[in-house]
């Protein structure tokens, strides 16, 4: 099983609360950085990545970045906190349960990102929006 | 205001049948994983189980003493989580306490007898 | 499953005593390591995480240390209300294993 890797330090002395005034507390996410992938043409992928770790702030949210270039195809996996943009962007879907990939413009690439609000979110990321999690051809995607 | 609520904890003879309700408010339920951890009279703390999100698929794992005689499960519309516990033992006798995994938030506990 | 041993099982100690509690893993859990406190009749309560860090509204007198498979709680003045049972927990894989307690007790 996982481990849980916790961040270095936790500040817990606010509350944190989402727009419904709900409490937040820090989230699990897949947190792997980035790493070579194989998720290509695909409805949706499992990150694969073997790291869950507690996020350091509650507000920070599980992100997921795909990139393809001529060279390769990476997957990064992290916490972060949608106040602030993350590779220039801001995470405009950070409140949704479900890691739906949304296509930014970058030169040279194709760039998608997502960020979602549930534990372990970013473990599976959608490229389609139609797609329904219960899918049992789910594709796996392995890391090189 | 955060809180867990455990239920449904009493007597129950050997080989026997209990369901736990834990009913969380104050944060978006769906969005967490949660588990249950136990102690019985006198004793130490006891890992029992923990549910992921249903939208990851609701997977579940167990501590081997109760693999296969208790199941775990959630309801996010009600945001209640359920400790359902069957062929109960005389050494499932506990307190269950119903946590948020991995984070620092448990509920008061509710007391399991299981006694002839 | 990964055997967590906490040394001692009891311990006698008057208010201002420094206290240390250790913690052993059978295996390596790098630093996955948490820390509760519990009073008879209360849910524990969460004091360290990752081995060394503090939750937040614990007082500065607990503190935690150690990495791989020995760990230490140490309580620099011991103060009336930390009289309770202490706990050692792994969270490095499933299931999370508790050390069977230390309880402190006053001289």
């Known amino acids: 099983t996982i481990p849980p890797h916790v961040q270095k330090s936790v500040n817990n002395d606010m509350i944190v609360t989402d727009n419904n005034g709900a409490v937040k507390f820090p989230q699990l996410c897949k947190f792997c950085d980035v790493r070579f992938s194989t998720c290509d043409n695909q409805k949706s992928c499992m990150s694969n990545c073997s790291i869950t770790s507690i996020c350091e702030k509650p507000q920070e949210v599980c992100v997921a970045v795909w990139r393809k270039n001529d060279e390769n195809i990476t997957l990064e996996t992290v916490c972060h906190d949608p106040k602030l943009p993350y590779h220039d962007f801001i995470l405009e879907d950070a409140a949704s349960p479900k890691c739906i990939m949304k296509e930014k413009k970058k030169p040279g690439e194709t760039f998608f990102m997502c960020s979602c609000s549930s534990d372990e979110c970013n473990d599976n990321i959608i490229f389609s929006e139609e797609y329904n999690t219960s899918n049992p051809d789910l594709l796996l995607v392995i890391f090189q | 205001q955060v809180q867990l609520v455990e239920s449904g904890g009493g007597l129950v003879e050997p080989g026997g049948s209990l369901r736990l309700s834990c009913a969380a408010s104050?944060?978006?339920?769906?969005?967490?994983?949660m588990s249950w951890v136990r102690q019985a009279p006198g004793k130490g703390l006891e890992w029992v189980g923990r549910?992921?999100?249903?939208?990851?698929?609701?997977?579940?794992d167990f501590a081997a003493p109760v693999k296969g005689r208790f199941t775990i499960s959630r309801d996010d519309s009600k945001n209640t989580l359920y400790l359902q516990m069957n062929s109960l033992k005389t050494e499932d006798t506990a307190v269950y306490y119903c946590?948020?995994?991995?984070?620092?938030?448990w509920g008061q506990g509710t007391l399991v007898t299981v006694s002839s | 499953d990964i055997q967590m041993t906490q040394s001692p099982s009891s311990l006698s100690a008057s208010v201002g005593d420094r206290v240390t509690i250790t913690c052993r893993a059978s295996q390596s859990i790098s630093s996955y390591l948490n820390w509760y406190q519990q009073k008879p009749g209360k849910a524990p309560k969460l004091l360290i995480y990752?081995?060394?860090s503090l939750q937040s509204g614990v007082p500065s007198r607990f503190s935690g240390s150690g990495s791989g498979t020995d760990f230490t709680l140490t309580i620099s003045s011991l103060q009336p209300e930390d009289f309770a049972t202490y706990y050692c927990?792994?969270?490095?894989?499933?299931?999370?294993?508790f050390g069977q307690g230390t309880k402190v007790e006053i001289k």
């Open positions: 927990q792994q969270s490095y894989s499933t299931p999370p294993t």
């Open positions: 990752a081995a060394s």
């Open positions: 946590t948020l995994d991995l984070r620092a938030y």
């Open positions: 549910i992921k999100t249903t939208i990851s698929g609701g997977a579940t």
């Open positions: 104050g944060f978006t339920f769906s969005n967490y994983w």
